[in-house]
């Protein structure tokens, strides 16, 4: 039971940090206007990985993407791959991990195979929230460094007299999304990992007993796993899911509204 | 578009509240400027007014003597003046706030006059 | 606040003559974001409400003749009227819409000779 919850709430949680990945991967505050210290413009200047907007005081947003590749800094380049990446495997996780969920039944699918699906699917977790938190400190710390150097000369003479504002950016919402998703998503998968380790069949041979029932022979294994007709002749412990005695973990094991959550 | 309410001739010390009818467009998806005219000479903004939340944006000089409010069901902005004295003697325009920050529609101006 | 200095204070000139008029701020208004200028010119004529003639520095407002050219960046702008018309008699006043407070410029007085 405790596997079958930790799987669950570690898909879950994955499943809420990708999602917060994908979200933080479409904002377009990224980074903002700074505010702070700074003469109080009409303007409202913010930045995302694909576009740029200006939102004015009069309550008009426009927004302009980058319609340029090889015009881009290589820095927003790459966080834009971290995410992508980020994105793509935590997908590919999700799918993975459907299958790999010990609520759903799918044919005959051993739990070996689960706790493969499980642990790959977990890894794929731990990975792209990994990358969600690289885009993220990437883009971060290239604000860090453009701020400081936008401080140092935050007033450009013009001509002696006129003086020009720097635009200085900070920290956008979509940092503190994608910060916080992507650490969700590496939880997501360090859990799905540890499922993976109570999902794992041991390879013990366990002694058949048989009881003789008039009409049929059927035997039953300690265990309580249903073996097939016959003697001996499932000696691994594997799950036949065709009714017969369950254990603690398949409580659930004909199909119900439970079963495809 | 922007109709405003007629002149006003009022003594020291009083208060007085001017009007300004929009039409033609929705009302509450601008904000709503006001401008202030002194003996025809240079314009001075005052501040301005989000009809949709009801924010408010004043300029330190008319904090405390301005003051806006809307009715939305009417699609009119309002602007109390209060304590008046000779310096308030002026031309007021209401102007609907637009794209590039400017102040595109104007009112015909309410001309307030103070004197005892 | 902003300063906005217009020059000439006042203008005489003929019909069809061409005429530009000078704007210029405290601090630079070009906005980093979208490299636009934002610097908005006004036309007042007698007894009437100023009207929007061009916005962002040269961006005219539909409706607004052609003889009318806004340009400038940063902190220099001019109004450039390509060809005098009597109905052009008015006050120009261009406008920070930049900084808080907006502040308009003392204006420059157009008259016909």
């Known amino acids: 039971m405790a596997v079958t919850a930790c799987q669950g709430l570690g898909f879950v949680v994955s499943l809420i940090g990708i999602a917060g990945i994908i979200a933080a991967t479409c904002m377009d505050q990224w980074s903002t206007q700074d505010l702070y210290n700074n003469p109080v413009t009409a303007v409202f200047n913010y930045q995302g990985l694909w576009r740029s907007c200006v939102r004015e005081s009069s309550g008009f947003t426009e927004c302009r993407g980058y319609f340029t590749l090889l015009g881009l800094p290589a820095m927003l380049q790459a966080v834009r791959a971290l995410m992508i990446v980020g994105i793509v495997l935590g997908a590919i996780g999700l799918l993975v991990s459907i299958f790999a969920l010990k609520c759903i039944r799918i044919g005959s699918m051993e739990d070996s195979a689960k706790a493969n699906m499980t642990l790959t699917s977990g890894i794929m977790f731990i990975v792209s929230g990994l990358c969600a938190i690289a885009g993220v400190s990437v883009f971060a710390n290239m604000l860090v460094t453009n701020f400081w150097m936008s401080t140092a000369n935050m007033y450009t003479g013009m001509g002696g007299m006129v003086q020009t504002v720097q635009t200085r950016y900070t920290f956008g919402a979509a940092l503190f999304v994608g910060w916080v998703a992507g650490g969700l998503t590496l939880i997501g998968g360090v859990m799905m990992c540890i499922a993976c380790r109570g999902l794992a069949p041991e390879e013990t041979n366990y002694k058949a007993v048989s009881y003789h029932a008039s009409g049929h022979s059927v035997a039953y294994k300690p265990g309580g796993f249903k073996a097939s007709t016959g003697f001996g002749s499932n000696t691994k412990n594997k799950k036949i899911y065709d009714g017969g005695a369950r254990t603690e973990d398949e409580v659930q094991s004909y199909p119900s509204k439970h079963d495809y959550v | 578009q922007l109709q405003q309410s007629g002149p006003e001739l009022e003594k020291p010390g009083a208060s007085v509240k001017i009007s300004c009818k929009a039409s033609?467009?929705?009302?509450?998806?601008?904000?709503m400027n006001w401008v202030k005219q002194s003996n025809g000479e240079s314009l001075e903004w005052i501040g301005n007014?989000?009809?949709?939340?009801?924010?408010?944006t004043y300029t330190q000089k008319f904090k405390g003597k301005a003051t806006f409010t809307v009715d939305t069901s009417s699609s009119t902005a309002y602007m109390q003046l209060k304590s008046l004295t000779s310096e308030d003697s002026a031309v007021y325009f209401c102007?609907?706030?637009?794209?590039?920050?400017?102040?595109?529609?104007w009112g015909q101006g309410t001309s307030v006059t103070v004197s005892s | 606040d902003i300063v906005m200095t217009q020059s000439p204070s006042s203008l005489t000139v003929t019909a069809g003559e061409k005429v530009t008029l000078s704007c210029k701020s405290s601090?630079?208004?070009?906005?980093?974001?979208?490299?636009?200028?934002?610097l908005t010119w006004y036309q007042q004529r007698p007894g009437q409400p100023p009207k929007l003639l061009i916005y962002?520095?040269?961006t005219r407002e539909s409706g607004v003749p052609v003889r009318f050219t806004g340009s400038g960046s940063g902190a220099d702008f001019t109004l450039t009227i390509s060809s005098v018309q009597a109905e052009d008699l008015a006050v120009y006043f261009c406008q920070n819409a930049y900084f808080y407070p907006l502040t308009f410029g003392t204006g420059t007085k157009l008259e016909l000779r």
């Open positions: 007014i989000d009809p949709y939340y009801g924010d408010t």
């Open positions: 601090q630079s208004l070009l906005n980093s974001g979208n490299q636009k200028n934002y």
């Open positions: 102007a609907r706030y637009n794209r590039g920050n400017t102040m595109d529609y």
């Open positions: 033609g467009y929705s009302f509450t998806g601008y904000k």
């Open positions: 962002w520095a040269s």
